[in-house]
Interface confidence: low
C-alpha cells in the first residue's frame, strides 16, 4: 500500500508511517516501527506535558519562587502546570504571573482609593479637605476629621491631610 501523507488525529507521520502521539502526562522515548507501537514514558515528579505530544522531555512545573513573591495557587500534575499567584501584599506583573511586585503603600496624607488585588497595584488618592491619613498603608482610606461639635467640643487645632483635628472643651465664659 501507498505510504500515508497524512495521519489521523493523535498520530504523527514519521518514516513514512503514522505513529501514535504520547498521551498527556507522558513523553516520547521511541517512535513506532512497523513492528512496535510508539514507546512513551510518564513524566517524572515535578514535570508535566499537557497535550498529546511527541516531546522527548517533559516540561518542569513552574516554580512559584517566594523570593519573587510567588506562591502556589494550584499544584501541578503530570498533565498540568503549577499555577502561581502572588503572596498577600504582592500582585502579578503579567497575566502569566511569572513574577510579582509588592503593593505600594499610600504615604501619610494619602489614602487608599482602590485596594490592590493579585493583578493590580494599590491606587492612592490625596486626602481631601476634611479627611486625613497619618500612616503609610496599603489598606487604609482617608479618615474624616473628628466632628468636635457632635461631642459638644470645639476645634482647638485644625486638621491637615496628615493629622486629625484636636478637640477641646467649650470656653464656658462665652455667652
Amino acid at each position: 500500500p501507498e505510504p500515508p501523507t497524512a495521519c489521523r488525529e493523535k498520530q504523527y507521520l514519521i518514516n513514512s508511517q503514522c505513529c501514535s502521539l504520547c498521551q498527556p502526562g507522558q513523553k516520547l522515548v521511541s517512535d513506532c516501527t512497523e513492528f512496535t507501537e510508539t514507546e512513551c514514558l510518564p513524566c517524572g515528579e515535578s514535570e508535566f506535558l499537557d497535550t498529546w505530544n511527541r516531546e522527548t522531555h517533559c516540561h518542569q512545573h513552574k516554580y512559584c519562587d517566594p523570593n519573587l513573591g510567588l506562591r502556589v495557587q494550584q499544584k501541578g500534575t503530570s498533565e498540568t502546570d503549577t499555577i502561581c499567584t502572588c503572596e498577600e501584599g504582592w500582585h502579578c506583573t503579567s497575566e502569566a504571573c511569572e513574577s510579582c511586585v509588592l503593593h505600594r503603600s499610600c504615604s501619610p496624607g494619602f489614602g487608599v482609593k482602590q485596594i490592590a488585588t493579585g493583578v493590580s497595584d494599590t491606587i492612592c488618592e490625596p486626602c481631601p479637605v476634611g479627611f486625613f491619613s497619618n500612616v503609610s498603608s496599603a489598606f487604609e482610606k482617608c479618615h474624616p476629621w473628628t466632628s468636635c461639635e457632635t461631642k459638644d467640643l470645639v476645634v482647638q487645632q485644625a486638621g491637615t491631610n496628615k493629622t486629625d483635628v484636636v478637640c477641646g472643651p467649650q470656653d464656658r465664659l462665652r455667652a
Epitope: Y63, N67, L68, V101, L102, R104, S105, S107
Partner: antibody
C-alpha cells in the same frame, strides 16, 4: 540547603574585564534568582544586579548598566558576573547571593584592579 | 538608586539594647514591606538576620527584632552579647527589580 561556591581571587589591569563564577549546589538551580553584591575595602555593600537562572532574565543596577553582564550555565548550575572596563575603584570583594532576599551567600571573590 | 541612610556607628554595653535606623524614601522603604537586615563580621560574608521588615530566618535568636514606620526601618538588638559586635546593613526593594543597601552601621559592644 543551597550552597554557593565562588571562583578564586583575581588581579586585573585597568581597562580589562573580569568574570567571576558562582556554582550552586543543593536545591533546584532554576528555581531561584541570584543577586550579585560587591564590597570595596572598608566600604559598605552595593547591589549590582540579579539573574533568574530559569529564563536567564537579568536586572542590573543603573550604576553598572553597560558594564556588567550576568549569565548562567544550567548544565553546571553556575552563574557568571562579568565586569568590563575595570578601574582601580572596582577593587572589591564580589559576592553572589540567593534571591532578592539574599538569604544564602557565596564566600566572596576578591578582585584587585591595579596597574 | 541612592543608598539608604544608616548611622555610621552604634554602641551598647552587654545586656543592654541598641537600635539602628535605616532611612529611605517613599519609593523604597516607605513603598514596600521588603526590608532586610544583615550582620557581617570582619572577613566574613554577610548573614541575613531579618527579612520582610520583621521576619527572622530560623536559627536567628529573638534578641534581633525589627520594625518599620513610614520611610524608616529599625533593627533592635536586645540583651547585647560580645558576638553581636559586627557591621549591620539594611536593604530594601526599590521597585523595578532593584535592591538598595544602607551604608552600614558598626555596632560596638562596650
Amino acid at each position: 540547603q543551597v550552597q554557593l561556591v565562588q571562583s578564586g581571587a583575581e588581579v586585573k589591569k585597568p581597562g580589562s574585564s573580569v568574570k567571576v563564577s558562582c556554582k550552586a549546589s543543593g536545591g533546584t538551580f532554576s528555581s531561584y534568582a541570584i543577586s550579585w553584591v560587591r564590597q570595596a575595602p572598608g566600604q559598605g555593600l552595593e547591589w549590582m544586579g540579579m539573574i533568574n537562572p530559569s529564563g536567564g532574565t537579568t536586572s542590573y543596577a543603573q550604576k553598572f548598566q553597560g558594564r556588567v553582564t550576568m549569565t548562567r550555565d544550567t548544565s553546571t548550575s553556575t552563574v557568571y558576573m562579568e565586569l568590563s572596563s575595570l578601574r582601580p575603584e572596582d577593587t572589591a570583594v564580589y559576592y553572589c547571593a540567593r534571591g532578592f532576599r539574599m538569604d544564602q551567600w557565596g564566600q566572596g571573590t576578591l578582585v584587585t584592579v591595579s596597574s | 538608586q541612592s543608598a539608604l541612610t544608616q548611622p555610621p556607628s552604634a554602641s551598647g554595653s552587654p545586656g543592654q539594647s541598641v537600635t539602628i535606623s535605616c532611612t529611605g524614601t517613599s519609593s523604597d522603604v516607605g513603598a514596600y514591606n521588603f526590608v532586610s537586615w544583615y550582620q557581617q563580621h570582619p572577613g566574613n560574608a554577610p548573614k541575613l538576620i531579618i527579612y520582610d521588615v520583621r521576619k527572622r530566618p530560623s536559627g536567628i535568636p529573638d534578641r534581633f527584632s525589627a520594625s518599620k514606620s513610614g520611610n524608616t526601618a529599625s533593627l533592635t538588638v536586645s540583651g547585647l552579647q560580645a558576638d553581636d559586635e559586627a557591621d549591620y546593613y539594611c536593604s530594601s526593594y526599590a521597585g523595578n527589580n532593584e535592591m538598595v543597601f544602607g551604608g552600614g552601621t558598626k555596632l560596638t559592644v562596650l
